[in-house]
Interface confidence: low
């Protein structure tokens, strides 16, 4: 665990119960960098400071997670706390693995979504396709598409079938898939972001 995570946790622990509630609500509407999904509202609202820190780091990685936390704290008028958080993060940035510091490739190349960039790797490496389908069903997948993917015999063929529908998706639809991947296989997403 890196220094940024500790700094985020320190900041959130020092919020009052009311401030933490306000922080979560602001987090639901704060502008996000391209390629990043939003933490689901249902899960978010029941979290304590430690849960929320874990979720921020798994969704946004340490560097962007700290930056986002500082932005929300500033929006709440807690400039001093935001400054302390960023100071602590920058102080430790040299010690963290270089890959963690880099923004995701989807942010670096706005023309190509993360999902499209890493199509081959996702087909080969995603293991819990059923989970993704449940997350996407009714939002970007029709009942027919959902059943068609489920009918495939292996995970790679399921993912291939899923990707056959993505040409019709807009950026937001692809964000939903990325968000579902972050929730179900965050280590895979982080690995691909560093690659």
């Amino acid at each position: 665990m890196g220094r940024a995570r500790d700094a985020i946790l320190d900041a959130l622990e020092n919020l009052t119960a009311e401030e933490l509630k306000k922080f979560k609500l602001k987090l639901l509407s704060v502008p996000l960098r391209e390629g990043y999904g939003r933490i689901p509202r249902g899960a978010l609202l029941s979290m304590d400071a430690l849960d929320l820190t874990d979720k921020l780091v798994s969704f946004y990685l340490e560097t962007y997670g700290a930056e986002l936390t500082a932005n929300v704290l500033r929006d709440m008028g807690l400039q001093e706390m935001a400054g302390q958080l960023q100071a602590a993060t920058h102080q430790g940035s040299g010690a963290a693995p270089a890959g963690i510091q880099a923004p995701p490739q989807s942010a670096a190349k706005p023309g190509l979504h993360f999902i499209d960039q890493h199509r081959a790797a996702l087909i080969a490496r995603v293991t819990n396709v059923e989970w993704l389908l449940d997350a996407l069903y009714g939002k970007v997948l029709t009942d027919e598409q959902y059943q068609a993917v489920r009918a495939e015999p292996t995970n790679p063929s399921k993912m291939r079938k899923l990707f056959s529908f993505t040409p019709a998706w807009n950026w937001t639809c692809k964000d939903l898939l990325l968000q579902a991947l972050r929730e179900s296989q965050s280590y895979l997403v982080e690995d691909l972001e560093r690659s």
């Epitope: 665990m1 320190d10 622990e13 249902g42 899960a43 029941s46 304590d48 430690l50 849960d51 874990d54």
Partner: antibody
Framework: EVQLQQSGAELVRPGSSVKMSCKTS????????ITWVKQRPGQGLEWIGY????????EYNEKFKDKAALTSDTSSSTAYMQLTSLTSDDSTIYFC???????????WGQGTTLSVSS | DIVLTQSPASSAVSLGQRATISCRAS??????????MHWYQQKPGQPPKLLIK???TLESGVPARFSGSGSGTDFTLNIHPVEEEDTATYYC?????????FGGGTKLEIK
């Protein structure tokens, strides 16, 4: 008074499934999570996973991801754990507990003993 | 995963004396505000009982002879003076990250 009452002992066949319950009372069920812990006789405690009953959000110990499924029913203030593809290795006692702030476990059920035998 | 190592595995302490149980984490489980380490007591045939949370905060209803200390990776549970009813197994547990882990336990016997 906060109480967690677990279902009675189970004797099941290898390869089958079992669903045990943890009925809570004395507090607002949806304001807390419920965690499940495994303990083999004379041995230590193993964390299985938890569920935030307010929204059904779950987290599992990787070791139990394909073994346990946690659910809850807010109308009866009851949490459930289903264990599948049972083997003799699953024969032991299982506890449910309430998750308090800081993710410590402040109230525990009395335990459900599972015996898997042909 | 963070591993918690408890020592000793078992201990026999004379009535009225001090019992000390150690728990070492394989990495820090503390921030400047809190330590995410908790202590439980378990008697035979019973579920565990929370004694101390956040390394040093005594749970409501727990006798003051129980105390906890430590931060970072090293934590201690002290019982002083020990009483007959303290015969039990004691476990530490961290909640720093998933998966939450328990220590292997320390069996305390009162002489």
């Amino acid at each position: 008074e906060v109480q967690l009452q677990q279902s009675g002992a189970e004797l099941v066949r290898p390869g089958s499934s079992v669903k045990m319950s943890c009925k809570t009372s004395g507090y607002t069920f949806t304001n807390y999570g419920i965690t499940w812990v495994k303990q083999r006789p004379g041995q230590g405690l193993e964390w299985i996973g938890y569920i935030y009953v307010g929204n059904g959000y779950t987290e599992y110990n990787e070791k139990f991801k394909d073994k346990a499924a946690l659910t809850s029913d807010t109308s009866s203030s009851t949490a459930y754990m289903q264990l599948t593809s049972l083997t003799s290795d699953d024969s032991t006692i299982y506890f449910c507990a309430r998750i308090a702030q800081g993710r410590c476990f402040d109230y525990w059920g009395q335990g459900t003993t599972l015996s898997v035998s042909s | 995963d963070i591993v918690l190592t408890q020592s000793p595995a078992s201990s026999a302490v004379s009535l009225g004396q001090r019992a000390t149980i150690s728990c070492r984490a394989s990495q820090s489980v503390s921030t400047s505000s809190y330590s995410y380490m908790h202590w439980y007591q378990q008697k035979p045939g019973q579920p565990p009982k929370l004694l101390i949370k956040y390394a040093s905060t005594l749970e409501s209803g727990v006798p003051a002879r129980f105390s906890g200390s430590g931060s970072g990776t090293d934590f201690t549970l002290n019982i002083h003076p020990v009483e007959e009813e303290d015969t039990a197994t004691y476990y530490c547990q961290h909640s720093w990250e998933l998966p939450y882990m328990f220590g292997g336990g320390t069996k305390l016997e009162i002489k």
